[in-house]
Structures are given as structure tokens and as C-alpha cells.
Interface confidence: medium
């Protein structure tokens, strides 16, 4: 569809509320340091301009592309050079280079203060005083901290945020009603952001073929009754949606996502029996529901795959005629039969199958050469199965906090050059796999665990790319998307690492430790643990456990003392000396 005015087209399609929300998200994700009021001003100017184009599509500048309009608007920010440094150079470029330049300057770890949650009464007053501003502030604060957040999904989070306040600010016990809802939104939001970041990394670093392969596998698991051509249609449309959102084209992305939801709901019969309850919901909820929908039941009469992909004499002929389609059909057929496998495992199997065909179809006797290809899958399948089994046993034995600590030690030994805050963040999140996945039935454990780990390890890769310090991390992150997790799992103690010099300051603690929340206390202790391992990478589990137990006892003792600060000042150096002796 060609429209005289793209901005008018999107305004009409999306409606004013969603249009304004998406433009605010787009601007906040590009200019992450700009004050809220500045962004609101820019959004209002764009919205007023869009309205003039709706009234007259031939009006001046209405024919310009959205990138041109939005880029021009961003480049009017007066403090661009002072606030963003070299990002201001983007404004000297022409489209499409200017937009690419803005994208490259998105910061996954912006230097922004953690969001502090005010008192419930303060929040409710702000909500009632100016609901629109309150919700815009939410979009702004989330978007600037998560510059790749899936924009149409962020509108859904904002709608839930609004509903929570509308309900709970009327409740007798506002806090009891609101705080659990806000906690849930925060946790779900962080998970959603991390999942989308992997999709964007997949598209940007490995190309749309990698993303399409992921989508074929995942959608074939979800919709095992759908034809291959149907799955392919959904994959093509979904790839367009995510390519747009990852590229900053948020209006097009939201519009196309709505079209995809409409298509799925109009074609439920050829997709899945599970879509019905999603399709009765309003747009934002419907799209979210469709994205999260459970796997449909597998057809009962699926024949063996071996007939078409191993035993057939036409395997090489079919492969040669259209490699990507044949491999796509193989992946579709394998995935729809294996909802119990992780998507990453399915992609490894497809890769192994492709490698075998590349080798065997050039051999003297191709059929003889590829006859045992499915046997070669066995070790690939067993590796993640064993990993999940061992780690779930460890999680059940230790509990979440100590399981996180085991992972902190494991990963610090593998890649000690990585910054301590990154190791703590990533290992804590890796450790959450236990509570998330280990309680599930056997058939759901691997897809839950390995695909979650892929998301968490992508965060490590994204942070490391910004400040590269380890060749091992770079290698695991860049060589193969599907083999990232096995690559990290296979890393051993870095023998080349020169231990970090001991710094007593790192292990000096104060009375403020006692007022921290349980989570903040854990982070402090885990930070110390990482520093210990960096100082003594060859320390045994027993040595580290001894030091950490002493640390916990020391903190507990001083937090019970009358003069806490004096206790920390006196007991701290003793703890440090005892720790050094224990690790000598």
C-alpha cells in the first residue's frame, strides 16, 4: 500500500492514543537521557503535525518518511551535543544513514538511576491528579531504560499499569492491592524486555534467516496442526513486525502486529484450536495473548520423519531444488513433533542435518552417507537434557540464593575479566531458571530452561559488546547464535587470567548494610563473592563457602549490635584477615 502521507496513514490506523504512546516510546528509546518534559513537547508537536496531514495529505512535509520527520524532530533538541556527545553527529547524516546512526547509539545499560517506587498514597495522588501524564511517565521511564522494549507490548503493560492504579487506589488497603501488581508488572516487564532484546540481536547480528529459523521452530511447536505454508506465512509476517520494531519503526510495527493478530483470528481453523479465547479480547490484550498462547495438541497420526528425510532416495534432489524450503520443512516437521525440545536444540538439529546433506549429497553414495543422520542427533539431544537434570538437582539441593552463588563462582571462573556488576546480574538471572523451570513436568523443562538461558546469555553478550574485555565471551557470543549456551557451558577455568590484586576497600562494609532489603543484601554478598573469586580463582568450593558463611555471620552480628558502625569498623578488618588466611 502506498499512501500520500505515511504519518497520516499511521495516525488513522493506530488512533491518537496509540500514536502518541508509540512516538513517545520511540523518542525515549533514542534519546534516553532527555528529560520527560522535552519528550512530551516533541510528541505533541509531531501529533499536531500528523493531524494536519490527516486533514490534508497534500499539506507541506506530509509526504516525508517517518524516519525523516522523527529524525528532524530529534535533531531539534538543543542539548544534543552536550548530553549525547558523538550521537549529535548523526544529525549531519541523511536518511537512512541517520536512523542507522541513532540505532547504533542506543545504550543497553544507560547511566540512569534505579527507579524508586514512591509511597502508595503519593502514587495514587499523582495518578488521580493527572492520569495521562502519569501513564506517559511510565512509558518514558521504561522505554529509556529498555531501548529495545517491544513497543506495542509496552502499550499493553501501560494499560495494565493504568488498570492496577484505577482499581487499587479505590481499595481499602491500597498497598496490599497495588504492590503485588506492580511487582508482577516489573518482573514481567524485565522478562519481556530481555526476550525482545534476543529477537533484535538475532535479527541485527545474525540476519533475518536466523530469526526466521527460530520462528519456524517456535511456531511449529505452538501450532503443530497448521500446514507448513501456514507456518511460513506467520513467520514471514512476524519477521516483518520484529524487524520494524528492532529498527525503530514503531508505528509500522504496531500496525503490522495488529494486522497479524487480525489475520490469525480470522484463520484460526487453519492455525490452532487454542486461539479462540485470545481472539475475543481487545487489541493489545489479544496480541499479547496470541504471542503467549499455549501449544496446540499434536496431530495423532504424524508419520515417521525418517521416510521423507532419511530413507527417501529424493532427499538430495529435494534439498538441491530449494535448500531453504526443504530445511524449513524439516525444521517444521521436527519441531511440531517435539514440543519437549528447546527451540535452540531444534535449530542445532536442523544445522546438523544441513551439514550432513551438504557433505553427503556430494558423496559417491549419498543415501549410504546420510542413512545414520538421525543417530548423530542423539548427543545433541542428550547434552541439554543432562544439563537441565544436573542443574535442577543442584537447585533443589541448594535453593535459589545458593544456586545463584554456585553459578556466580562457575561463571566468574570461566570469564573473570567481565565486570563484577555484569557477572552478578547475569548469574542471578541464570539462577532464576531453577524456580522458573525445575518445578515443571519433564516434557516442559528443557524448552523452558534452555530458551530462558539463551535470553539471559544474550544480556551478557549485549553488555559485553559495549565494553569488550574477554575474547572467550566475544567468541561464544558471535560465532553461532544457537550454540551460545553450549559454548558458555563448555568454558573452563581461565588459566591465562592473572588474579586481581586484593583490595581491602572492596571488602569494607558499613552499617547501611543493615537497612538494605533482603535482595540488596544478597547483591552485596554476591558482589563480594565475585571479587573473592577474581582474587583467588582456584579457591575450592569449601574455601569459598567458609568465607561466605563467616561473612554472613559477621554481618548478622554487627546488624544486631547497639553501635553497628563501630562493630563494622572493628569486625571488618578481622573478617578480611581471616578470609585472606582461609584462601591462602
Amino acid at each position: 500500500d502506498t499512501h500520500k502521507s505515511e504519518v497520516a496513514h499511521r495516525f488513522k490506523d493506530l488512533g491518537e492514543e496509540h500514536f502518541k504512546g508509540l512516538v513517545l516510546v520511540a523518542f525515549s528509546q533514542y534519546l534516553q537521557q532527555c528529560p520527560f518534559e522535552e519528550h512530551v513537547k516533541l510528541v505533541n508537536e509531531v501529533t499536531e503535525f500528523a493531524k494536519t496531514c490527516v486533514a490534508d495529505e497534500s499539506a507541506e512535509n506530509c509526504d516525508k518518511s517517518l524516519h525523516t520527520l522523527f529524525g528532524d524532530k530529534l535533531c531539534t533538541v538543543a542539548t544534543l551535543r552536550e548530553t549525547y556527545g558523538e550521537m549529535a553527529d548523526c544529525c549531519a547524516k541523511q536518511e537512512p544513514e541517520r536512523n542507522e546512526c541513532f540505532l547504533q547509539h542506543k545504550d543497553d545499560n544507560p547511566n540512569l538511576p534505579p527507579l524508586v517506587r514512591p509511597e502508595v498514597d503519593v502514587m495514587c495522588t499523582a495518578f488521580h491528579d493527572n492520569e495521562a501524564t502519569f501513564l506517559k511517565k511510565y512509558l518514558y521511564e521504561v522505554a529509556r531504560r529498555h531501548p529495545y522494549f517491544y513497543a506495542p507490548e509496552l502499550l499493553f503493560f501501560a494499560a495494565r499499569y493504568k488498570a492496577a492504579f484505577a482499581e487499587c487506589c479505590q481499595a481499602a488497603d491500597k498497598a496490599a492491592c497495588l504492590l503485588p501488581k506492580l511487582d508482577e508488572l516489573r518482573d514481567e516487564g524485565k522478562a519481556s524486555s530481555a526476550k525482545q532484546r534476543l529477537k533484535c540481536a538475532s535479527l541485527q547480528k545474525f540476519g533475518d534467516r536466523a530469526f526466521k529459523a527460530w520462528a519456524v521452530a517456535r511456531l511449529s511447536q505452538k501450532f503443530p496442526k497448521a500446514e507448513f505454508a501456514e507456518v511460513s506465512k506467520l513467520v514471514t509476517d512476524l519477521t516483518k513486525v520484529h524487524t520494524e520494531c528492532c529498527h525503530g519503526d514503531l508505528l509500522e510495527c504496531a500496525d503490522d502486529r495488529a494486522d497479524l493478530a487480525k489475520y490469525m483470528c480470522e484463520n484460526q481453523d487453519s492455525i490452532s484450536s487454542k486461539l479462540k479465547e485470545c481472539c475475543d479480547k481487545p487489541l493489545l490484550e489479544k496480541s499479547h495473548c496470541l504471542a503467549e498462547v499455549e501449544n496446540d495438541e499434536m496431530p495423532a497420526d504424524l508419520p515417521s520423519l525418517a521416510a521423507d528425510y532419511v530413507e527417501s532416495k529424493d532427499v538430495c534432489k529435494n534439498y538441491a531444488e530449494a535448500k531453504d524450503v526443504f530445511l524449513g520443512m524439516f525444521l517444521y516437521e521436527y519441531a511440531r513433533r517435539h514440543p519437549d525440545y528447546s527451540v535452540m536444540l531444534l535449530l542445532r538439529l536442523a544445522k546438523a542435518y544441513e551439514a550432513t546433506l551438504e557433505k553427503c549429497c556430494a558423496a559417491a553414495d549419498p543415501h549410504e552417507c546420510y542413512a545414520k543422520v538421525f543417530d548423530e542427533f542423539q548427543p545433541l539431544v542428550e547434552e541439554p537434557q543432562n544439563l537441565v537434570k544436573q542443574n535442577c538437582e543442584l537447585f533443589e539441593q541448594l535453593g535459589e540464593y545458593k544456586f545463584q552463588n554456585a553459578l556466580l563462582v562457575r561463571y566468574t571462573k570461566k570469564v573473570p575479566q567481565v565486570s563484577t556488576p555484569t557477572l552478578v546480574e547475569v548469574s542471578r538471572n541464570l539462577g532464576k531458571v531453577g524456580a522458573k523451570c525445575c518445578k515443571l513436568p519433564e516434557a516442559k523443562r528443557m524448552p523452558c530452561a534452555e530458551d530462558y538461558l539463551s535470553v539471559v546469555l544474550n544480556r551478557l553478550c549485549v553488555l559485553h559488546e559495549k565494553t569488550p574485555v574477554s575474547e572467550k565471551v566475544t567468541k561464544c557470543c558471535t560465532e553461532s547464535l544457537v550454540n551460545r549456551r553450549p559454548c558458555f557451558s563448555a568454558l573452563e577455568l581461565d588459566e591465562a587470567y592473572v588474579p586481581k590484586a586484593f583490595n581491602a576497600e572492596t571488602f569494607t562494609f558499613h552499617a547501611d548494610m543493615c537497612t538494605l532489603s533482603e535482595k540488596e543484601k544478597q547483591v552485596k554478598k554476591q558482589t563480594a563473592l565475585v571479587e573473592l573469586v577474581k582474587h583467588k580463582p582456584k579457591a575450592t568450593k569449601e574455601q569459598l563457602k567458609g568465607v561466605m558463611d563467616n561473612f554472613a555471620a559477621f554481618v548478622e552480628k554487627c546488624c544486631k549490635a547497639d553501635d553497628k558502625e563501630a562493630c563494622f569498623a572493628e569486625e571488618g578488618p578481622k573478617f578480611v584477615a581471616a578470609s585472606q588466611a582461609a584462601l591462602a
Epitope: E227, E230, S232, K233, S270, D308, F326, M329, E333
Partner: nanobody, 119 residues
Framework: EVQLLESGGGLVQPGGSLRLSCAAS????????MLWVRQAPGKGLEWVSV????????YYADSVKGRFTISRDNSKNTLYLQMNSLRAEDTAVYYC????????????WGQGTLVTVSS
């Protein structure tokens, strides 16, 4: 009863063009993915192109990519194949077929239309 009727074949010189049509009846065309397959003299069936029920996406065999275009008109229950830059090796009987629910097999196909590329 499913019926697929191909037309538009004929003799054409190398580098020339042809447009094949396939009229479908007896099934719900607009919910069916369709494809073109061909059989060269003395050879097996080779699939040429697939089109989803909605018109996108489309897929092509590597041997025809960039030269052939598959399309459909659901209001007329008709499938098309525009063939440009024809080569001698494109000589074959072309069949339109209803795409299968899976695997490289075809549920129904027509009687075919012969395309001969020769100078």
C-alpha cells in the same frame, strides 16, 4: 470433486515469456496454499513455486528464482505462473497442485500444460 485445469502452455523461444493459468474448483481455494510443479521429459517431478492462501509468502526453486513469479486471484479461484527469460531446461509439463498439509507430496494436481522452449 477437486478439479484443477492448467492452460497457457506452448512453444516459445529461449529468452521469451509465457503466463500459465490454473482454474480451481471443488474445494475452498482461498484457504488452500497452492504450487506449481513440473516434469521434464524422462525426469521426475520437480516443484517450482509455492504460494500461501493469502498471496504472501511465496517460495521458488533455486532454478527459477528471479525469472518466475507465482500469483493468485482468490476472487476468480485462479493460480498463475508468469515465466520470463525462459531457457531450454524449462521445457516440461507444468502442473498446478494443492499444497499438502506437510511433506513433499501433493494432494491433487491437474492434467498439466506443456511448455516447450526451443529455437
Amino acid at each position: 470433486e477437486v478439479q484443477l485445469l492448467e492452460s497457457g502452455g506452448g512453444l516459445v523461444q529461449p529468452g521469451g515469456s509465457l503466463r500459465l493459468s490454473c482454474a480451481a474448483s471443488g474445494f475452498t481455494f482461498d484457504t488452500s496454499s497452492m504450487l506449481w510443479v513440473r516434469q521434464a521429459p524422462g525426469k521426475g517431478l520437480e516443484w517450482v513455486s509455492v504460494i500461501h492462501q493469502s498471496g504472501t509468502p511465496t517460495y521458488y526453486a533455486d532454478s527459477v528464482k528471479g525469472r518466475f513469479t507465482i500469483s493468485r486471484d482468490n476472487s476468480k479461484n485462479t493460480l498463475y505462473l508468469q515465466m520470463n527469460s525462459l531457457r531450454a531446461e524449462d521445457t516440461a509439463v507444468y502442473y498446478c497442485a494443492k499444497f499438502p498439509s506437510s511433506r513433499m507430496k501433493f494432494d491433487y494436481w491437474g492434467q498439466g500444460t506443456l511448455v516447450t522452449v526451443s529455437s
